[in-house]
């Protein structure tokens, strides 16, 4: 197509409306004023432009705002957001949660794209911390968001934000991440009573130390096996048979099915067979009667 720069007579756009979808790309370029486009961005998303036409509109905005788009435009980008590169987004200063939601909505149902990751990064850095409302929003769109953060990034999550976390948001977290999140959760839920506290803290227990597990065993919590299997091995090993029995309650019978898997396997190896036999589950592999148990870690500390 021959480059044409002048807008044909009578085709100058006075508003952003459906008539523009019949414009050729060069006509859009020549006949749509960038400032008009910026003020009527909210209309673009309700008009069935082709991807090629959207490219032209993006180009016009890029020319108008070389330093990055203002938030008033960003909030109404809609599908034009999918045309943005991470480099474009790094120029933005997004401060409104409404803007973030509007753009996440466009990408809804898809994996987190590099554009979305950049947007979230810009937004969170701009806010200085992952506050509750932001976390609420991000985990609603991306349940795995929290577990995609490094332990260092998680350290900026204030305890108050933990209230926004749902169990499924922690499904893919590894022990290092739970080590950071658990103390925050413990602080956030500290004023709750026993059973309510356990319901809230349960998802975070993969970061709990031995002493907290011992304390829980005194509270009739009836921890399920799925939760027990996610506990830190080093936190489970020092627990006595009696403590594990109290911790699991009626779920203790599930230990038999898990006896070959960590942390159950390693815990069994640390228990006296006599004590294991008291459970009546047929657990094997404990320390035979009459054997002396040396705590080598304590010996190393003393030498």
């Amino acid at each position: 197509e021959v480059e044409k720069t002048a807008c044909p007579s009578g085709k100058k756009a006075r508003e952003i409306d459906e008539s523009l979808i019949f414009y050729k790309k060069w006509e859009l370029e020549a006949c749509v004023d960038a400032a008009l486009l910026a003020t009527q961005m909210d209309r673009v998303n309700a008009i069935p432009f082709t991807y090629e036409q959207l490219d032209v509109l993006k180009h016009k905005l890029d020319e108008l705002y070389p330093q990055g788009y203002p938030e008033s435009v960003i909030q109404h980008l809609g599908y034009l957001f999918l045309k943005m590169s991470p480099e474009d987004i790094r120029k933005w200063n997004v401060t409104s949660l409404e803007t973030l939601k509007a753009l996440l909505e466009v990408n809804k149902g898809h994996e987190m794209s590099p554009q979305v990751a950049t947007l979230i990064d810009r937004f969170v850095k701009g806010r200085g911390q992952l506050d509750k409302d932001t976390l609420d929003t991000l985990t609603a769109f991306y349940p795995g968001y929290l577990c995609s953060l490094s332990p260092e990034e998680l350290s900026s999550v204030p305890p108050s934000s933990i209230w926004a976390v749902r169990p499924q948001d922690l499904d893919t977290c590894d022990p290092r991440q739970l080590d950071v999140l658990y103390p925050k959760a413990r602080l956030a839920f500290q004023n709750m009573n026993g059973s309510e506290y356990f319901v809230k803290i349960q998802s975070f227990l993969g970061g709990a130390p031995t002493e907290d597990l011992k304390a829980l065993s005194q509270q009739n919590v009836s921890m399920d096996l799925a939760t027990f299997m996610k506990l830190r091995t080093d936190a489970v090993l020092p627990l006595t048979v009696a403590e594990v029995q109290k911790l699991l309650g009626p779920h203790v019978e599930g230990l038999k099915a898990e006896e070959r898997h960590r942390p159950v396997r390693d815990w069994i190896l640390r228990q006296r067979q006599d004590d294991l036999d008291t459970l009546g589950l047929g657990l094997q592999g404990g320390i035979p009667n009459g054997y002396l148990v040396l705590d080598l870690s304590m010996q190393e500390a003393l030498s």
């Epitope: 459906e18 979808i21 019949f22 309700a46 069935p48 432009f49 809609g78 409404e98």
Partner: antibody
């Protein structure tokens, strides 16, 4: 004049699918989004989704994701809405409506879909 | 998704009286907001768009106001044909939602 003509009433069994058509006339079909809205007996309006007749691109309300499919045939200026795995709660009047940048300005007459065993 | 809450659910008035219907959005929708009228047995029709603009052919007794989260539809003097259901509607990006409706009936 601008018109949207919908297909006739349907009676379906639970678990079946229904496909409603909406024929546009009096305007350029590819120039406007086509929306689908339903209304259960005695209830309010519920937006189901929209199709871009230009590209075939669709956006569905989360509630209907996975059950609804919107398609179009530009050669006959017709949009289609198919709803699968029907249940009794899907009994409703289904409307197609032309989307303008400011709202839905032209509506079809509605298609009654009854789901009953 | 943005939730629209209309009030009242029912409005019982006489012809000639003024009707006021409110709609509140759970978050700001700017002015991407419309009102529809639906008479019994008919398809809805667009009354007001962009919060305050009357659609083609809509008489001046219908007016809309508001922006952000709070919107109002006013019918200055009810005519017999105005007794119908009214729905507010928003489009935020491409996610469209309707209010639950307000029925205006004859007292």
């Amino acid at each position: 004049q601008v018109q949207l003509q919908q297909s006739g009433a349907e009676v379906k069994k639970p678990g079946a699918s229904v496909k409603v058509s909406c024929k546009a006339s009096g305007y350029t079909f590819t120039g406007y989004y086509m929306h689908w809205v339903r209304q259960a007996p005695g209830q309010g309006l519920e937006w189901m989704g929209r199709i871009n007749p230009n590209s075939g691109g669709t956006n569905y309300a989360q509630k209907f994701q996975g059950r609804v499919t919107m398609t179009r045939d530009t050669s006959i200026s017709t949009a289609y809405m198919e709803l699968s795995r029907l249940r009794s709660e899907d009994t409703a009047v289904y409307y197609c409506a032309r989307g303008r940048y400011y709202g839905m300005d032209v509506w079809g007459q509605g298609t009654m879909v009854t789901v009953s065993s | 998704e943005i939730v629209l809450t209309q009030s009242p659910a029912t409005l019982s008035l006489s012809p000639g009286e003024r009707a006021t219907i409110s709609c509140r959005a759970s978050q700001s929708v700017s002015s991407n907001f419309a009102w529809y009228q639906q008479r019994p047995g008919q398809a809805p029709r667009l009354l007001i768009y962009d919060a305050s603009n009357r659609a083609t052919g809509i008489p001046p007794r219908f007016s809309g106001s508001g922006s952000g989260t709070d919107f109002t539809l006013t019918i200055s003097s009810l005519e017999p044909e105005d007794f119908a259901a009214y729905y507010c509607h928003q489009r935020s990006n491409w996610l469209y939602t309707f209010g639950q409706g307000t029925k205006v009936d004859i007292k």
